[in-house]
């Protein structure tokens, strides 16, 4: 015998108190699939959470975070404090990156500057708390008598002779 509840569409529930008739979900609740015997309570986006999508009879509300915070976890289950660039979030709040490290985002950890010498290159631009170092040509390329670094010639389009 077919379950009469299987005919109840999303947005309704199978009401046992009313001979298994399909009743609409009450306010502030939803059912996202058919054949449900109860509707789920809508998520409330309170406090630091703000409503990205309102709850409907067939889908839950979706939250994100108020400015100054960012989402963490599945479905934005948490809001974590943003820091400034050049900082990282610690147990005691936002702290400046230590010398030799940087963070160019409002979240995440401070990362060590690139070690240019590992690639046989020199430091072209020093690092800061907010920016990584910029590596330049290798020291050998900069030694006296070495040819200066010149940009490559632009590629010529076919069929065009040089000016």
């Amino acid at each position: 015998l077919q379950d009469p509840c299987s005919n109840c569409p999303a947005g309704t529930f199978c009401d046992n108190n009313r001979n298994q008739i399909c009743s609409p979900c009450p306010p502030n609740s939803f059912s996202s699939a058919g054949g449900q015997r109860t509707c789920d309570i809508c998520r409330q986006c309170k406090g630091v959470f703000r409503t990205r999508k309102e709850c409907s009879s067939t889908s839950n509300a979706e939250c994100d975070c108020t400015p100054g915070f960012h989402c963490l976890g599945a479905g934005c289950s948490m809001c974590e404090q943003d820091c400034k660039q050049g900082q990282e979030l610690t147990k005691k709040g936002c702290k400046d990156c230590c010398f030799g490290t940087f963070n160019d985002q409002k979240r995440g950890i401070c990362r060590p500057w690139t070690n240019c010498s590992l690639d046989g290159k020199s430091v072209l631009v020093n690092g800061t708390k907010e920016r990584d170092v910029v590596c330049g040509p290798s020291p050998a390329d900069l030694s006296p008598g070495a040819s200066s670094v010149t940009p490559p010639a632009p590629a010529r389009e076919p069929g065009h002779s040089p000016q």
């Epitope: 959470f49 934005c76 974590e80 404090q81 979030l89 709040g93």
Partner: nanobody, 121 residues
Framework: QVQLQESGGGLVQPGGSLRLSCAAS????????IGWFRQAPGKEREGVLC????????YYADSVKGRFTISRDNAKNTVYLQMTNLKPEDTAVYLC??????????????WGQGTQVTVSS
């Protein structure tokens, strides 16, 4: 049951002071941080200040540094937001929340309903 209740709001002239209270009940107050947020008409909600369970302060808004301070009285299960040199742009509904940690809020944290602060001459 769990409750957070804000009080102390009202109408104050520019340059004046107010002290808001956030009274908690129904949970182990000492284990939780308390954060203050505010929402001005037609604007996004913004974080103001937070106090950790151990008493350390975290400023969320640079605009209140030097004017607002936060303290807690664990014996009274209450956190206080002392606001001085108030400006018209501080006008908002102020509400408190109780996360475990000032830097991270969960969707099941407790929140109050808010208290209105109006700064106007």
């Amino acid at each position: 049951q769990v409750q957070l209740q804000e009080s102390g709001g009202g109408l104050v002239q520019p340059g004046g002071s107010l002290r808001l209270s956030c009274a908690a009940s129904g949970f182990t107050f000492d284990d939780y941080a308390i954060g203050w947020f505010r929402q001005a008409p037609g604007k996004e909600r913004e974080g103001v200040l937070c106090i950790s369970s151990s008493g350390g302060s975290t400023y969320y808004a640079d605009s209140v540094k030097g004017r607002f301070t936060i303290s807690r009285d664990n014996a009274k299960n209450t956190v206080y937001l002392q606001m001085t040199n108030l400006k018209p742009e501080d006008t908002a509904v102020y509400l408190c929340g109780a996360p475990r940690d000032c830097s991270r809020y969960s969707s099941d944290d407790y929140w109050g309903q808010g208290t209105q602060v109006t700064v106007s001459s």
